[in-house]
Amino acid sequence: IVGGQEAPRSKWPWQVSLRVHGPYWMHFCGGSLIHPQWVLTAAHCVGPDVKDLAALRVQLREQHLYYQDQLLPVSRIIVHPQFYTAQIGADIALLELEEPVNVSSHVHTVTLPPASETFPPGMPCWVTGWGDVDNDERLPPPFPLKQVKVPIMENHICDAKYHLGAYTGDDVRIVRDDMLCAGNTRRDSCQGDSGGPLVCKVNGTWLQAGVVSWGEGCAQPNRPGIYTRVTYYLDWIHHYVPKKP
């Protein structure tokens, strides 16, 4: 997370850390708890060549990475069938946990938005994660969860910005309908935040608007952060994840 600050302990109870096996269980991406037994993340975190179940664990909301780990095994990894690269889209995946999480005030699910929600500019939105704090600058110990408020940008404006200084023709969309843009040169998500949630407060409820997907660098001029637009994939999500009663 570029800019922003350490998150208060009481906030973002749906935030999770994805861990890959190595000399230690290392954080590599974020995710969000959308059901007691399901985590939403980015497809590029776990695919297109899907990792072994044996190589992956989920850590629920923790203030500082690695300090009080209780790693959870995953029973299924589901990558969106249309995913190839983040820039092309469909950068979304689901992880099914072996056991449902015991929800509490400290750890619970985030609400998915209604299909009609567009998340217009001006809406109060935040992105969270344990990723880099600037381009090629790692989050330093004790690895606190960070948060930053990011401005939403309309897709057509974001697309125009991404065409500035790019070889892509103006008639070729860079920012597609299944994407959402947020951030500026002082506030952005970065490497290691991928898969984590962009949430917006709508009528007093936090809704997950996006999944951290891609961008050219972090907090670069004319290059806002790009997120997978959750509303675009609600039907796909609910094909696997039970709706709340």
Partner: antibody, heavy 119, light 106 residues
Framework: EVQLVESGGGLVQPGGSLRLSCAAS????????MVWVRQAPGKGLEWVAF????????YYADTMKGRFTISRDNSKNTLYLQMNSLRAEDTAVYYC????????????WGQGTLVTVSS | DIQMTQSPSSLSASVGDRVTITCSAS?????MYWYQQKPGKSPKPWIY???DLASGVPSRFSGSGSGTDFTLTISSLQPEDFATYYC?????????FGQGTKVEIK
């Protein structure tokens, strides 16, 4: 001592049913995913089914799906395999095994129980 | 489903020989697991996460590989190594074992 002891095997007619049990001791049973593996006479190992620590997740080999049911009773430290519609090709030694928590290999095995399906 | 193919199915070797068993997965996996079984006995964990030796396994055993091709190697075969070895993946369910490789005395 960490131990798994299977029981319940025996001779059963084709189409019949049998329930295998596996008694666990020497470890906190409720912390571990458990697995059944079988081995037909003179043949190799075949994975049968998996059950997660709290029974929320179960998976079966395709040939066993719909006929076999894996379950557990954490209060009794016991794993079960209910086998219905048994066929001659289900004749095998059935092993109960524990999945290592950190590294997911099958680190503790029972001695096995022989199931013979024959008329 | 991922299929596992071991080769050879059996091999004859002498004490002191270097022995290599291969396991091929039908699609890419991250890790391979190996078990040793002797006649009339339960299998024992032998190698996990491709190259880590299970407790009590002698250092003459090693594991390697990535993607679809993995190997178990015995640098200098000893009398107690004559057994059947099975590979297994933990990529996704259903889990599958290879058909086994029987190491016999020449």
């Amino acid at each position: 001592e960490v131990q798994l002891v299977e029981s319940g095997g025996g001779l059963v007619q084709p189409g019949g049913s049998l329930r295998l049990s596996c008694a666990a001791s020497g470890f906190t049973f409720s912390d571990y995913g458990m697995v059944w593996v079988r081995q037909a006479p003179g043949k190799g190992l075949e994975w049968v089914a998996f059950i997660s620590s709290g029974s929320s997740t179960v998976y079966y080999a395709d040939t066993m799906k719909g006929r076999f049911t894996i379950s557990r009773d954490n209060s009794k430290n016991t794993l079960y395999l209910q086998m219905n519609s048994l066929r001659a090709e289900d004749t095998a030694v059935y092993y109960c095994t524990r999945r290592n928590y950190d590294d997911v290999y099958f680190d503790v095995w029972g001695q096995g129980t022989l199931v013979t399906v024959s008329s | 489903d991922i299929q596992m193919t071991q080769s050879p199915s059996s091999l004859s070797a002498s004490v002191g020989d270097r022995v290599t068993i291969t396991c091929s997965a039908s699609s890419s996996v991250t890790y391979m697991y190996w078990y040793q079984q002797k006649p009339g006995k339960s299998p024992k964990p032998w190698i996990y996460r491709t190259s880590d030796l299970a407790s009590g396994v002698p250092s003459r055993f090693s594991g390697s590989g990535s993607g679809t091709d993995f190997t178990l190697t015995i640098s200098s075969l000893q009398p107690e190594d004559f057994a059947t070895y099975y590979c297994q993946h933990y990529h996704s369910y259903p889990l599958t074992f290879g058909q086994g490789t029987k190491v016999e005395i020449k």
